[in-house]
Amino acid sequence: HTAAQDNCTCPTNKMTVCSPDGPGGRCQCRALGSGMAVDCSTLTSKCLLLKARMSAPKNARTLVRPSEHALVDNDGLYDPDCDPEGRFKARQCNQTSVCWCVNSVGVRRTDKGDLSLRCDELVRTHHILIDLRHRPTAGAFNHSDLDAELRRLFRERYRLHPKFVAAVHYEQPTIQIELRQNTSQKAAGDVDIGDAAYYFERDIKGESLFQGRGGLDLRVRGEPLQVERTLIYYLDEIPPKFSMKRLT
């Protein structure tokens, strides 16, 4: 057992198995569930994380299903199909041959159908609105301090370039974080806003995906910012296609 083996971990994803058996004896980590090699210098894709989450033994799973407040991601957890790059496949099906189309964050964007359902392309989610409600504090947070702290968090913890944090809105006790990232804006190596939002969501729930790190300790000028509920809204580059029946 060498020091190299001790070093061979995945700082950004604890749901991996790592060993120094990569090219030239380099460290290589594979995601649980899919066995796909992951890049541990950045966030793992939400698709691979969901797959790993679903592969964990039921009795060992300390993770919770999304709360009843998850208005947008109504379908909650499922075992997704991921492409070779770890992205969601446009069409997802369950074991009973019920299929549906998803966007780039894996959220259903059509009615459910059968195996004949066609999903021509993976539609990109280019705008994410994270709606938070914080616990009561002695006074309101200073807006510019809050803005700076959340931008810092997304850069330093989730590796997201500050240009993709479009705005931080605050009306006590509601905080809204707007993430925007068009296909044309996202360069190779850029963290996807959907992955950053998912890591943040899991952090807020106390289910950090980072290896051996403490949970999220969010403070604004030393004052703890404790979140009591989260809603995440996803806007796609092409509007979703639901029947009127669902809308009623």
Epitope: C8, P11, R151
Partner: antibody
Framework: QQLEESGGGLVKPEGSLTLTCKGS????????WMWWVRQAPGKGLEWIA?????????TYYASWAKGRFTISSTSSTAVTLQATSLTAADTATYFC???????????????WGPGTLVTVSS | FEMTQTPSSVSEPVGGTVTIKCQAS??????LGWYQQKPGQPPKLLIY???TLASGVPSRFKGSGSGTEFTLTISDLEAADAATYYC????????????FGGGTEVVVK
């Protein structure tokens, strides 16, 4: 723990070369970043490229270095920098350095090699 | 993105104090390092995280600041402090920009 660069020397304009950075007393198979930085005679420090030596091999390049410089890590003991189409402006001491954290955006260099001099001249 | 370091050169007597400033064109939180480089040697890390002293660095070296304005203060100057000092950040490395300041030469009289 030490780093050592090799491969420097005299190169003709438009020529190419490969610089190698080897570590001793530690293994590159960890969760950190390796960096190449250069310094022209009497000038300041200039970042060229960085590579993650854990699982993944992510790379970043200075805008001016893209296409002409290639950083790679094919083993757990060495990082290389390939340079092409060299000009007199590339004459410099080339350093490799080890980043102290696994987060590329919060990195600082706690271990440096002594540097290798590259002279581009006909 | 740019790191602007001032002054480019400073001269102070032994026992004096030198202050070097580094300004980032964008907010980099506290992600700044300071290095000392002597002729013919590689740089040596002095301070990281804007204010944390690297191992083995004397407490005469002090870093401060956050956001866009940073300062390195060297007090009780010694002859051995004569060197060039650089600030550095990697916060915007994905923009392909050089994160090093231009350097400050410190001459000890």
């Amino acid at each position: 723990q030490q780093l050592e660069e090799s491969g420097g020397g005299l190169v003709k304009p438009e020529g190419s070369l490969t610089l190698t950075c080897k570590g001793s007393g530690f293994d590159f198979s960890g969760t950190y970043w390796m960096w190449w930085v250069r310094q022209a005679p009497g000038k300041g420090l200039e970042w060229i490229a960085s590579i993650y030596v854990g699982s993944g091999s992510s790379t970043y390049y200075a805008s001016w270095a893209k296409g002409r410089f290639t950083i790679s890590s094919t083993s757990s003991t060495a990082v290389t920098l390939q340079a092409t189409s060299l000009t007199a402006a590339d004459t410099a001491t080339y350093f490799c350095a080890r980043g102290a954290t696994n987060n590329v955006f919060m990195n600082y260099f706690n271990l440096w090699g002594p540097g290798t001099l590259v002279t581009v001249s006909s | 993105f740019e790191m602007t370091q001032t002054p480019s050169s400073v001269s102070e007597p032994v026992g004096g104090t030198v202050t070097i400033k580094c300004q980032a064109s964008e907010d980099i939180s506290s992600n700044l390092g300071w290095y000392q480089q002597k002729p013919g040697q590689p740089p040596k890390l002095l301070i990281y995280g804007a204010s944390t002293l690297a191992s083995g660095v004397p407490s005469r070296f002090k870093g401060s600041g956050s956001g866009t304005e940073f300062t390195l203060t060297i007090s009780d100057l010694e002859a051995a402090d004569a060197a060039t000092y650089y600030c550095q950040t990697s916060y915007y490395i994905d923009d392909g920009v050089n994160g090093f300041g231009g350097g400050t030469e410190v001459v000890v009289k």
